[in-house]
Protein backbone atom coordinates (compact mmCIF):
# COMPACT_ATOMS: atom_id res chain seq x y z
CA UNK A 1 0.00 0.00 0.00
CA UNK A 2 1.21 3.50 -0.82
CA UNK A 3 2.14 6.11 1.72
CA UNK A 4 -0.45 8.73 2.44
CA UNK A 5 0.17 11.99 4.23
CA UNK A 6 1.59 11.78 7.75
CA UNK A 7 -1.29 13.83 9.09
CA UNK A 8 -4.71 14.62 7.73
CA UNK A 9 -5.94 18.04 8.77
CA UNK A 10 -9.35 17.88 7.15
CA UNK A 11 -10.56 18.87 3.72
CA UNK A 12 -9.82 22.56 4.26
CA UNK A 13 -6.16 22.17 5.19
CA UNK A 14 -4.48 19.32 3.34
CA UNK A 15 -0.86 18.76 4.31
CA UNK A 16 1.25 17.57 1.37
CA UNK A 17 4.07 15.27 2.40
CA UNK A 18 6.79 13.47 0.45
CA UNK A 19 5.58 10.60 -1.72
CA UNK A 20 7.55 7.69 -3.13
CA UNK A 21 9.04 8.07 -6.63
CA UNK A 22 6.49 7.91 -9.45
CA UNK A 23 3.87 9.34 -7.09
CA UNK A 24 2.77 12.81 -6.06
CA UNK A 25 0.40 14.28 -3.52
CA UNK A 26 -3.16 14.81 -4.71
CA UNK A 27 -4.70 17.70 -2.79
CA UNK A 28 -8.17 16.56 -3.84
CA UNK A 29 -8.05 13.11 -2.24
CA UNK A 30 -5.28 14.04 0.24
CA UNK A 31 -3.09 11.04 -0.55
CA UNK A 32 -0.10 10.06 -2.64
CA UNK A 33 -1.18 8.72 -6.03
CA UNK A 34 0.47 7.52 -9.23
CA UNK A 35 1.77 10.44 -11.26
CA UNK A 36 3.09 10.95 -14.77
CA UNK A 37 5.69 13.54 -15.65
CA UNK A 38 4.84 16.98 -16.92
CA UNK A 39 6.84 18.12 -19.90
CA UNK A 40 7.01 21.23 -22.03
CA UNK A 41 7.27 20.43 -25.75
CA UNK A 42 10.10 21.89 -27.82
CA UNK A 43 9.19 25.35 -29.13
CA UNK A 44 7.71 25.60 -32.60
CA UNK A 45 10.01 26.81 -35.39
CA UNK A 46 10.50 30.56 -35.71
CA UNK A 47 7.50 32.22 -37.28
CA UNK A 48 4.96 29.84 -35.80
CA UNK A 49 1.76 31.64 -34.87
CA UNK A 50 1.48 30.56 -31.24
CA UNK A 51 3.50 28.74 -28.62
CA UNK A 52 3.11 24.99 -28.44
CA UNK A 53 0.54 23.98 -25.82
CA UNK A 54 1.92 22.36 -22.71
CA UNK A 55 1.34 18.62 -22.51
CA UNK A 56 2.41 15.71 -20.35
CA UNK A 57 3.86 12.25 -20.44
CA UNK A 58 1.20 9.70 -19.56
CA UNK A 59 1.45 7.85 -16.24
CA UNK A 60 2.59 4.26 -16.51
CA UNK A 61 -0.38 1.95 -16.92
Amino acid sequence: MRRGPRSLRGRDAPAPTPCVPAECFDLLVRHCVACGLLRTPRPKPAGASSPAPRTALQPQE
Epitope: C24, F25, D26, L28, V29, V33, C35, G36, L38
Partner: antibody, heavy 125, light 107 residues
Framework: EVQLVESGGGLVQPGGSLRLSCAAS????????IHWVRQAPGKGLEWVAW????????DYADSVKGRFTISADTSKNTAYLQMNSLRAEDTAVYYC??????????????????WGQGTLVTVSS | DIQMTQSPSSLSASVGDRVTITCRAS??????VAWYQQKPGKAPKLLIY???FLYSGVPSRFSGSGSGTDFTLTISSLQPEDFATYYC?????????FGQGTKVEIK
Protein backbone atom coordinates in the same frame (compact mmCIF):
# COMPACT_ATOMS: atom_id res chain seq x y z
CA GLU B 1 -6.56 0.06 -23.62
CA VAL B 2 -8.00 1.88 -20.62
CA GLN B 3 -11.72 1.29 -20.22
CA LEU B 4 -14.39 1.86 -17.58
CA VAL B 5 -17.74 0.06 -17.86
CA GLU B 6 -20.65 0.87 -15.57
CA SER B 7 -23.59 -1.40 -14.83
CA GLY B 8 -26.41 -1.73 -12.34
CA GLY B 9 -28.66 1.18 -13.28
CA GLY B 10 -32.41 0.87 -13.68
CA LEU B 11 -35.81 1.91 -12.41
CA VAL B 12 -36.31 1.94 -8.66
CA GLN B 13 -39.03 3.28 -6.37
CA PRO B 14 -38.35 6.14 -3.94
CA GLY B 15 -36.75 4.76 -0.80
CA GLY B 16 -35.28 1.84 -2.73
CA SER B 17 -31.69 0.77 -3.31
CA LEU B 18 -29.37 0.10 -6.23
CA ARG B 19 -25.72 -0.91 -6.51
CA LEU B 20 -23.72 0.44 -9.42
CA SER B 21 -20.50 -1.21 -10.59
CA CYS B 22 -17.58 0.29 -12.49
CA ALA B 23 -15.32 -2.35 -13.98
CA ALA B 24 -11.89 -1.04 -14.98
CA SER B 25 -9.48 -2.54 -17.47
CA UNK B 26 -6.14 -1.41 -18.86
CA UNK B 27 -4.94 0.02 -15.54
CA UNK B 28 -4.98 -0.84 -11.85
CA UNK B 29 -7.50 1.14 -9.82
CA UNK B 30 -5.25 1.03 -6.75
CA UNK B 31 -2.97 3.61 -8.41
CA UNK B 32 -5.65 6.23 -8.99
CA UNK B 33 -8.76 7.70 -7.44
CA ILE B 34 -12.09 6.65 -8.94
CA HIS B 35 -15.00 9.08 -8.97
CA TRP B 36 -18.72 8.90 -9.55
CA VAL B 37 -20.26 11.88 -11.33
CA ARG B 38 -23.94 12.18 -12.20
CA GLN B 39 -25.98 14.19 -14.66
CA ALA B 40 -29.70 14.72 -14.22
CA PRO B 41 -31.72 14.89 -17.46
CA GLY B 42 -30.94 18.15 -19.25
CA LYS B 43 -28.71 19.36 -16.41
CA GLY B 44 -25.00 19.77 -15.74
CA LEU B 45 -22.41 17.54 -14.12
CA GLU B 46 -22.48 16.88 -10.38
CA TRP B 47 -19.70 15.07 -8.53
CA VAL B 48 -21.03 12.36 -6.20
CA ALA B 49 -18.15 10.55 -4.49
CA TRP B 50 -14.57 9.36 -4.76
CA UNK B 51 -12.57 6.41 -3.51
CA UNK B 52 -8.82 5.88 -3.43
CA UNK B 53 -8.71 2.07 -3.63
CA UNK B 54 -5.03 1.80 -2.73
CA UNK B 55 -5.60 3.64 0.55
CA UNK B 56 -9.27 3.03 1.18
CA UNK B 57 -10.28 6.63 1.78
CA UNK B 58 -13.59 8.03 0.53
CA ASP B 59 -15.55 11.26 0.40
CA TYR B 60 -19.05 12.26 -0.66
CA ALA B 61 -21.14 15.18 -1.86
CA ASP B 62 -23.36 16.55 0.89
CA SER B 63 -26.43 15.64 -1.18
CA VAL B 64 -25.69 11.90 -0.91
CA LYS B 65 -23.80 11.65 2.38
CA GLY B 66 -25.28 9.00 4.66
CA ARG B 67 -27.25 7.43 1.82
CA PHE B 68 -24.59 6.41 -0.71
CA THR B 69 -21.47 4.31 -0.07
CA ILE B 70 -18.53 4.12 -2.46
CA SER B 71 -16.15 1.18 -2.29
CA ALA B 72 -13.65 -0.73 -4.40
CA ASP B 73 -12.45 -4.29 -4.80
CA THR B 74 -8.88 -4.17 -6.05
CA SER B 75 -8.85 -7.91 -6.76
CA LYS B 76 -11.71 -7.38 -9.23
CA ASN B 77 -10.41 -3.96 -10.36
CA THR B 78 -13.92 -2.66 -9.80
CA ALA B 79 -15.45 0.27 -7.95
CA TYR B 80 -18.99 0.33 -6.58
CA LEU B 81 -21.63 2.83 -5.57
CA GLN B 82 -24.24 1.51 -3.17
CA MET B 83 -27.24 3.84 -3.27
CA ASN B 84 -29.84 3.61 -0.51
CA SER B 85 -32.90 5.70 0.40
CA LEU B 86 -33.12 6.86 -3.20
CA ARG B 87 -35.07 10.01 -4.02
CA ALA B 88 -36.58 11.37 -7.21
CA GLU B 89 -33.79 13.95 -7.35
CA ASP B 90 -31.23 11.14 -7.62
CA THR B 91 -32.55 10.38 -11.12
CA ALA B 92 -29.58 10.82 -13.44
CA VAL B 93 -27.02 9.19 -15.66
CA TYR B 94 -24.20 8.02 -13.39
CA TYR B 95 -20.65 7.99 -14.73
CA CYS B 96 -17.54 6.59 -13.15
CA UNK B 97 -14.28 8.28 -14.02
CA UNK B 98 -10.57 7.89 -13.35
CA UNK B 99 -8.58 10.85 -12.09
CA UNK B 100 -5.19 11.12 -13.76
CA UNK B 101 -2.31 12.96 -12.10
CA UNK B 102 0.89 14.53 -13.39
CA UNK B 103 3.69 15.57 -11.08
CA UNK B 104 3.89 19.34 -10.74
CA UNK B 105 6.42 20.15 -8.02
CA UNK B 106 5.36 17.08 -6.06
CA UNK B 107 1.65 17.86 -6.29
CA UNK B 108 -0.94 16.35 -8.62
CA UNK B 109 -1.96 18.35 -11.65
CA UNK B 110 -4.78 16.42 -13.22
CA UNK B 111 -8.33 15.77 -14.26
CA UNK B 112 -10.76 12.97 -15.00
CA UNK B 113 -9.33 11.44 -18.14
CA UNK B 114 -11.30 8.22 -18.68
CA TRP B 115 -15.05 7.96 -18.20
CA GLY B 116 -17.49 5.11 -18.48
CA GLN B 117 -20.40 5.17 -20.88
CA GLY B 118 -22.85 6.01 -18.10
CA THR B 119 -25.72 4.09 -16.55
CA LEU B 120 -29.19 5.56 -16.09
CA VAL B 121 -30.81 5.51 -12.66
CA THR B 122 -34.49 6.43 -12.57
CA VAL B 123 -36.20 6.91 -9.23
CA SER B 124 -39.95 6.98 -9.69
CA SER B 125 -43.10 5.45 -8.29
CA ASP C 1 -17.86 24.49 -1.13
CA ILE C 2 -16.15 26.28 -4.00
CA GLN C 3 -18.59 27.60 -6.61
CA MET C 4 -17.56 27.65 -10.26
CA THR C 5 -19.46 30.14 -12.39
CA GLN C 6 -19.21 29.85 -16.17
CA SER C 7 -20.09 32.48 -18.73
CA PRO C 8 -21.78 32.64 -21.06
CA SER C 9 -24.26 29.82 -20.45
CA SER C 10 -24.62 29.48 -24.22
CA LEU C 11 -23.21 31.06 -27.35
CA SER C 12 -23.71 30.86 -31.08
CA ALA C 13 -20.67 30.80 -33.34
CA SER C 14 -19.59 29.88 -36.83
CA VAL C 15 -16.93 27.49 -38.05
CA GLY C 16 -13.59 29.30 -37.95
CA ASP C 17 -14.59 31.66 -35.14
CA ARG C 18 -12.44 32.21 -32.09
CA VAL C 19 -14.46 31.24 -29.02
CA THR C 20 -13.71 32.14 -25.41
CA ILE C 21 -15.44 30.67 -22.35
CA THR C 22 -14.72 31.97 -18.87
CA CYS C 23 -14.98 30.36 -15.46
CA ARG C 24 -14.77 32.15 -12.12
CA ALA C 25 -14.11 30.37 -8.82
CA SER C 26 -15.64 31.65 -5.59
CA UNK C 27 -12.21 31.41 -3.94
CA UNK C 28 -8.60 30.95 -4.98
CA UNK C 29 -8.06 27.51 -6.54
CA UNK C 30 -4.51 28.18 -7.76
CA UNK C 31 -4.33 26.38 -11.13
CA UNK C 32 -6.41 23.35 -10.10
CA VAL C 33 -8.94 23.70 -12.92
CA ALA C 34 -9.83 21.29 -15.70
CA TRP C 35 -12.01 21.76 -18.77
CA TYR C 36 -14.25 19.10 -20.33
CA GLN C 37 -16.21 18.78 -23.55
CA GLN C 38 -19.47 16.85 -23.63
CA LYS C 39 -21.68 15.94 -26.58
CA PRO C 40 -25.32 14.81 -26.17
CA GLY C 41 -25.63 11.26 -24.91
CA LYS C 42 -21.88 10.90 -24.42
CA ALA C 43 -19.51 11.02 -21.46
CA PRO C 44 -17.42 14.14 -20.93
CA LYS C 45 -13.90 14.30 -22.39
CA LEU C 46 -10.93 15.93 -20.67
CA LEU C 47 -9.46 18.81 -22.69
CA ILE C 48 -7.31 20.86 -20.31
CA TYR C 49 -5.99 20.19 -16.82
CA UNK C 50 -4.10 22.33 -14.34
CA UNK C 51 -5.61 25.40 -16.05
CA UNK C 52 -3.31 25.38 -19.10
CA PHE C 53 -2.05 21.87 -19.88
CA LEU C 54 -3.47 20.26 -22.99
CA TYR C 55 -4.49 16.68 -22.42
CA SER C 56 -3.00 14.02 -24.69
CA GLY C 57 -4.69 13.79 -28.09
CA VAL C 58 -6.62 17.06 -27.77
CA PRO C 59 -6.23 19.36 -30.80
CA SER C 60 -3.96 22.37 -30.25
CA ARG C 61 -6.75 24.79 -31.18
CA PHE C 62 -7.90 24.31 -27.57
CA SER C 63 -6.03 26.25 -24.91
CA GLY C 64 -6.57 27.22 -21.31
CA SER C 65 -5.27 30.00 -19.13
CA GLY C 66 -5.73 31.59 -15.74
CA SER C 67 -4.93 31.11 -12.07
CA GLY C 68 -6.47 32.08 -8.78
CA THR C 69 -10.13 32.72 -9.48
CA ASP C 70 -10.38 33.53 -13.20
CA PHE C 71 -9.95 30.96 -15.96
CA THR C 72 -10.47 30.86 -19.70
CA LEU C 73 -10.94 28.16 -22.31
CA THR C 74 -10.22 29.32 -25.86
CA ILE C 75 -10.93 27.56 -29.14
CA SER C 76 -8.79 29.39 -31.67
CA SER C 77 -10.70 28.30 -34.77
CA LEU C 78 -13.99 26.54 -34.16
CA GLN C 79 -14.45 23.27 -36.07
CA PRO C 80 -17.74 21.45 -36.80
CA GLU C 81 -16.91 18.77 -34.21
CA ASP C 82 -16.45 21.41 -31.49
CA PHE C 83 -20.15 22.18 -31.15
CA ALA C 84 -20.82 20.78 -27.68
CA THR C 85 -21.19 21.76 -24.03
CA TYR C 86 -18.06 22.72 -22.08
CA TYR C 87 -17.57 22.45 -18.33
CA CYS C 88 -14.90 23.76 -15.99
CA UNK C 89 -14.11 21.94 -12.77
CA UNK C 90 -11.98 22.77 -9.75
CA UNK C 91 -10.03 19.97 -8.11
CA UNK C 92 -8.22 21.82 -5.35
CA UNK C 93 -10.47 20.43 -2.66
CA UNK C 94 -13.41 18.14 -2.11
CA UNK C 95 -16.08 18.46 -3.35
CA UNK C 96 -14.62 18.93 -6.85
CA UNK C 97 -17.25 21.27 -8.24
CA PHE C 98 -18.21 21.85 -11.87
CA GLY C 99 -19.37 24.98 -13.61
CA GLN C 100 -22.93 24.94 -14.93
CA GLY C 101 -21.75 24.45 -18.51
CA THR C 102 -21.50 26.51 -21.69
CA LYS C 103 -23.33 25.26 -24.76
CA VAL C 104 -21.61 26.18 -28.03
CA GLU C 105 -24.17 26.16 -30.83
CA ILE C 106 -24.02 26.73 -34.57
CA LYS C 107 -24.89 30.26 -35.64
Amino acid sequence: EVQLVESGGGLVQPGGSLRLSCAASGFTISSNSIHWVRQAPGKGLEWVAWVTPGVGSTDYADSVKGRFTISADTSKNTAYLQMNSLRAEDTAVYYCARRVCYNRLGVCAGGMDYWGQGTLVTVSS
Amino acid sequence: DIQMTQSPSSLSASVGDRVTITCRASQDVSTAVAWYQQKPGKAPKLLIYSASFLYSGVPSRFSGSGSGTDFTLTISSLQPEDFATYYCQQSLMTPPTFGQGTKVEIK
